[in-house]
């Protein structure tokens, strides 16, 4: 699987999940988020050669087409597959509020 366990341990040029740390205050200007200060959102990147974690028959065909026709611009894209939520804490006045934000952390990628 093209997940953090594999991708973070290997120098993989093809489609894989890559580490990306986002600081809420410095990177996004979200000064009001109290905790966490930031988090690993991660992102997917890298080429999608034939049979590289193909998501659908279409992406398999597209990957094969691109392999056999290297000059063609059409090829599958490396996109998030599994995402996890992130819990944040902020204050409304002096009242703490905890929210779970869905689909915030990329855990694995696929070619689609």
């Amino acid at each position: 699987a093209l997940d953090t366990n594999y991708c973070f341990r290997n120098l993989e040029e093809n489609c894989c999940v890559r580490p990306l740390y986002i600081d809420f205050r410095q990177d996004l200007g979200w000064k009001w988020v109290h905790e966490p200060k930031g988090y690993y959102a991660n992102f997917c990147s890298g080429p999608c050669p034939y049979l590289r974690s193909a998501d659908t028959t279409h992406s398999t065909v597209l990957g094969l087409y691109n392999t056999l026709n290297p000059e063609a611009s059409a090829s599958p894209c490396c996109v998030p597959q599994d995402l996890e939520p992130l819990t944040i804490l902020y204050y409304v006045g002096r009242t703490p509020k905890v929210e779970q934000l869905s689909n915030m952390v990329v855990k694995s990628c696929k070619c689609s």
Partner: antibody
Framework: EVQLVQSGAEVKKPGASVKVSCKTS????????MNWVRQAPGAGLDWMGQ????????NYNEMFEGRVTLTADTSTSTAYMELSSLRAGDIAVYYC??????????????WGQGTLVTVSS | DIVMTQTPPSLSVSPRETASISCRAS??????????MHWYLQKPGQSPQLLIY???NLESGVSDRFSGSGSGTDFTLRISRVEANDTGVYYC?????????FGQGTKLELK
Amino acid sequence: EVQLVQSGAEVKKPGASVKVSCKTSGYIFITYWMNWVRQAPGAGLDWMGQIFPAWGSTNYNEMFEGRVTLTADTSTSTAYMELSSLRAGDIAVYYCARGYGNYALDAMDYWGQGTLVTVSS
Amino acid sequence: DIVMTQTPPSLSVSPRETASISCRASESVDSYGNSFMHWYLQKPGQSPQLLIYLASNLESGVSDRFSGSGSGTDFTLRISRVEANDTGVYYCQQNNEDPLTFGQGTKLELK
């Protein structure tokens, strides 16, 4: 230039609902809380609630809880305020106002032009 | 809810004089070393505009004739050398406690 442009005046019957829009430009919509404030004729300002457009988190004033719904469309950078079960006491000018940015609950540095909502049978 | 009480309800000032508006909160609006109190002016037929942020910080583009002071529960907005353009209703606002609340307003007129 930051701009908040609200929809036009509305006339509604008692018991009906009204939905006011606030189209923004000149800043990154998902970076600031959007507040809604109402002002009855000749009266002061009442904070209704707020929404964080990035994921739709909301905080409401209990005075309006259950009747007001705040939403946001990030694709058009537009915020919406819907008020249901309208009554004569809801006749007011409704403002959208951008939060200052340092806190969730904050001062408001940019305001829409206001939308007059009239309730009449 | 924190109740904000402004005095006086209305004020008539001669041009070039100084006007003072008070705002008293029903409980302290101080937290983490800040006073969560702000001031707005609503000119006739217009939307409110932010003048003072966090009790004493002048908002960008606002004349330095406006100044704010105070902490805890008692705050003051001063307008020096009052001009015709300063007429309107002034509001204080706190955001230390949910819900955010405003004062009832002080109407400033020129003599």
